[in-house]
């Protein structure tokens, strides 16, 4: 059951994990739903009546029976995890505490304008976790205007005190804000030997590089694998740091893979969601129920469902045994991983996906269809949206991407003579036009951003953001494309398309069926070759055949340029201009989005 | 219960030399990875040298020119030669079996299957 409300001047009674200290009841309940086992807490709030020491701590909580007993008690707030909730969660937190230190390691210490620049710091900063900043009106001058960046092992604060005139708050790391690389690469036969600050087991190094992600200190990872020749430390996740952020040691050593945890592009690859079936391995931990289960994939749904589960094993059913059903074994640990994994006894084990909620609803896997032509099939660009406008009659106006459950990026030239948000129609999951009737159900418009640099298509900002009149429910139809993260500006997208029902030459009509095509991207120096007439800017992106033939038109605008990297796909483009369509040595040139995402992060995430 | 002892260690004038050994028991040598660390005091724990089973060599930047790793897998024992010796190689010599990296920047913790031993000083002073 998802109880999301707080309740005041209650204290759990019991269960006790581990105490830690935030700066708030709500940024309580956050930390205790990404812990892999607190179900409940308390957090004691300021107050007279409560011994200061106390103040700001959070007790994180389990319980077999998923509830504790309730005390009343001034000043303490108490609630539940959203574990329990089926609703989308973030860990971004961009509040600013007020007259709060939060304390931990002072690692740096400088001088900046405003707590924003501050906070814009610790972001960038690899090790930064949060920040305290004295303000202009701090008593003592020489640390008037300091921002002092913290890390802690926990990446939460190790005591928060009151102090006047200064503020403190969190990396927004988590929210997509960093500007840090994005270093996806995985890399085989290599140990990186600096230290490590915890192990665990892991399956394979992609699950290693996946919790490395979410842990608070892991920088890099080395991961042994089932091949490893020391038996004991076969599938070991080494999760390490160094001073300068990098590894400073590299030693070749077969059946060992080294990576780089993904903060800086968490928002475009899954986490904390470990969706594969791993055959002929068996997860060891606390068991905590088994169950019958007709298969591995409905086994990891008993697990999914059972809330203080976090991975499973199924031993498939021995022939006419059991009404074919096999043992499906719920098992959970301190830390969410595995106590030790065997090989070779026949078990197929897994994870719970209960945790896929935290990931990005974008990074989820489209069902794999074959296809072919250039006619799409339904659910394939499920992102992909058809506006209308409904003045003076009713006809499709542009494309646009799905980019949250409120939020649809397009073109700003779209626009043009567009008086009122009214007119305006979003249909999603759609396939052909032709499906769209009276009666066929569609978003309103609440808002048109248009980006207030926004002249004409060609000159640049083509990009505008509108907001739904009601949230989008995601489906197998209809549901967001990544963004692409700051940090994979320097990724070569080979896989791209644009798609659109858009004219199929120059003098054309509207497409019915929504049509795809493959387009690889062209360069910034040779896309300028071919328009010496414009300034094709960093912000712009470009993609076509040198021999044409393959291009947006007419009606493509605001839609999608699509590229799949890491079988995730990421909005790399917004179909904006081109001289003709398709035409030999003219690509078309799209609005680059990583270059917006700031803006587009800043508008839809707005309070 | 797998052992490591090193011994060598001792003070020493800059410029000179010194051989570090580390004999190892209750584990297969010649199938493990063994490595110098050293940690100075309110230093981290930094890996000098390591050797992998099947004779692979790394050095840090440091030592790279003046510091020789080698093993005697018929001996079960591990040498670190140390010459053209400087002050700031003063600190005490930990050897380990295949541990990669330390915890906490702490050179005595391990995690499954890796192993120190209890250390040796080194000195360079005039």
């Known amino acids: 059951e998802c109880v999301t409300q707080l309740l005041k001047d209650t204290c759990f009674e019991g269960g006790d994990i581990t105490t830690v200290f935030t700066p708030s009841a709500k940024y309580c309940q956050v930390v205790c739903t990404y812990h892999p086992r607190c179900l409940l807490f308390t957090f004691t709030a300021e107050s007279p009546s409560e011994d200061p020491t106390r103040w700001f701590t959070c007790v994180l909580k389990d319980s077999v029976t998923e509830t504790l007993p309730r005390v009343n008690r001034t000043a303490a707030i108490s609630g539940y995890s959203f574990k329990q909730c089926s609703h989308q969660i973030s860990a971004c937190n961009k509040d600013i505490y007020v007259d709060l230190d939060m304390k931990g390691i002072n690692y740096n210490s400088s001088v900046a304008k405003s707590a924003q620049e501050c906070q814009e710091r610790c972001t960038d900063d690899v090790h930064c976790h949060f920040f305290t900043y004295a303000t202009r009106q701090f008593p003592s001058l020489e640390h008037r205007n300091i921002c002092l960046l913290k890390h802690t092992q926990t990446g939460t604060p190790t005591r928060i005190t009151k102090l006047d005139k200064v503020v403190s708050g969190f990396s927004l790391k988590s929210c997509a804000l960093s500007n840090l690389a994005c270093i996806r690469d995985i890399f085989p036969n290599t140990v990186f030997a600096d230290s490590n600050i915890d192990s665990v087991m892991a399956p394979d190094a992609f699950v290693c590089g996946r919790i490395c992600t979410h842990h608070p200190g892991c920088l890099f990872f080395t991961f042994f694998s089932q091949e490893w020749p020391k038996e004991s430390q076969r599938n070991l996740c080494l999760l390490k740091t160094s001073e300068s952020g990098l590894p400073s040691t590299r030693i070749k050593k077969s059946k060992a893979l080294s990576g780089f945890s993904l903060q800086s592009c968490r928002h475009s690859i899954p986490v904390f969601c470990h969706s594969s079936f791993y055959h002929d391995t068996d997860f060891l931990g606390e068991e905590l129920d088994i169950v019958a289960a007709k298969s591995h994939e409905a086994c990891q749904k008993l697990c999914t469902n059972a809330v203080r589960c976090q991975f499973f094993t199924y031993t498939p059913a021995q022939a006419s045994c059991n009404e074919g059903k096999g043992k499906c074994y719920l098992k959970l640990s301190s830390n969410g991983s595995p106590t030790k994994i065997l090989h070779g006894r026949g078990g197929i084990s897994g994870y719970t996906l209960r945790l896929c909620k935290m990931d990005n609803e974008c990074t989820t896997k489209i069902k794999p269809r074959i296809v072919g032509g250039t006619a799409s099939v339904r659910g394939e660009w499920p992102w992909q949206v058809t506006l209308h406008t409904t003045s003076p009659t009713q006809r499709h106006l542009c494309g646009g991407s799905i980019i949250g459950n409120q939020w649809i990026l397009t073109a700003a030239h779209c626009f043009y003579g567009v008086e009122s948000p009214k007119i305006l129609r979003v249909y999603s999951g759609i396939l052909n036009q032709s499906e769209i009737k009276e009666d066929t159900s569609f978003f309103g418009v609440q808002e048109i951003i248009i980006h207030d640099q926004y002249k004409m298509a060609e000159s640049g900002y083509d990009i505008a953001l509108l907001k739904l009149e009601t949230t989008v429910n995601y489906t197998d139809s209809q549901r967001p494309i990544c963004l692409p993260s700051k940090g994979d500006r320097n990724v070569i997208y080979t896989d791209c398309w644009v798609t659109g029902w858009g004219y199929r030459k120059l003098r054309d009509k509207i497409q019915n069926t929504l049509q795809k095509a493959k387009i690889p991207l062209v360069t910034n120096e040779e896309c300028q070759k071919r328009y010496r007439g414009h300034k094709i800017t960093h912000k712009m992106i470009c993609a076509g055949y040198r021999e044409g033939g393959k291009d947006a038109c007419k009606g493509d605008s605001g839609g999608p340029l699509s590229c799949k990297h890491n079988e995730v796909w990421h909005l790399v483009g917004i179909t904006s201009w081109g001289e003709g369509c398709a035409q030999r040595e003219r690509p078309g040139v799209y609005t680059n989005v990583v270059e917006y995402v700031d803006w587009i992060l800043e508008k839809t995430q707005a309070v | 219960q797998v052992q490591l002892v090193e011994s060598g260690g001792g003070l020493v004038q800059p410029g000179g030399s010194l051989r570090l050994s580390c004999a190892a028991s209750?584990?297969?040598?010649?199938?493990?990875?063994m490595a110098w660390y050293r940690q100075a005091p309110g230093n981290e724990c930094e890996l000098v040298s390591t050797?992998?089973?099947?004779?692979?060599?790394y050095y840090a930047d440091s030592v790279k020119g003046r510091f020789t790793i080698s093993r005697d897998n018929s001996k079960n024992t591990l040498y670190l030669q140390m010459n053209s010796l400087r002050a700031e190689d003063t600190a005490v010599y930990y050897c380990?079996?295949?541990?990669?990296?330390?915890?906490?920047?702490?050179?005595?913790?391990?995690?499954?299957?890796?192993?120190w031993g209890q250390g040796t000083l080194v000195t360079v002073s005039s």
């Open positions: 209750e584990f297969t040598f010649d199938d493990s990875d």
């Open positions: 050797i992998t089973s099947d004779g692979g060599t």
């Open positions: 380990a079996a295949d541990q990669w990296g330390s915890a906490e920047g702490d050179c005595t913790s391990s995690y499954p299957g890796g192993y």
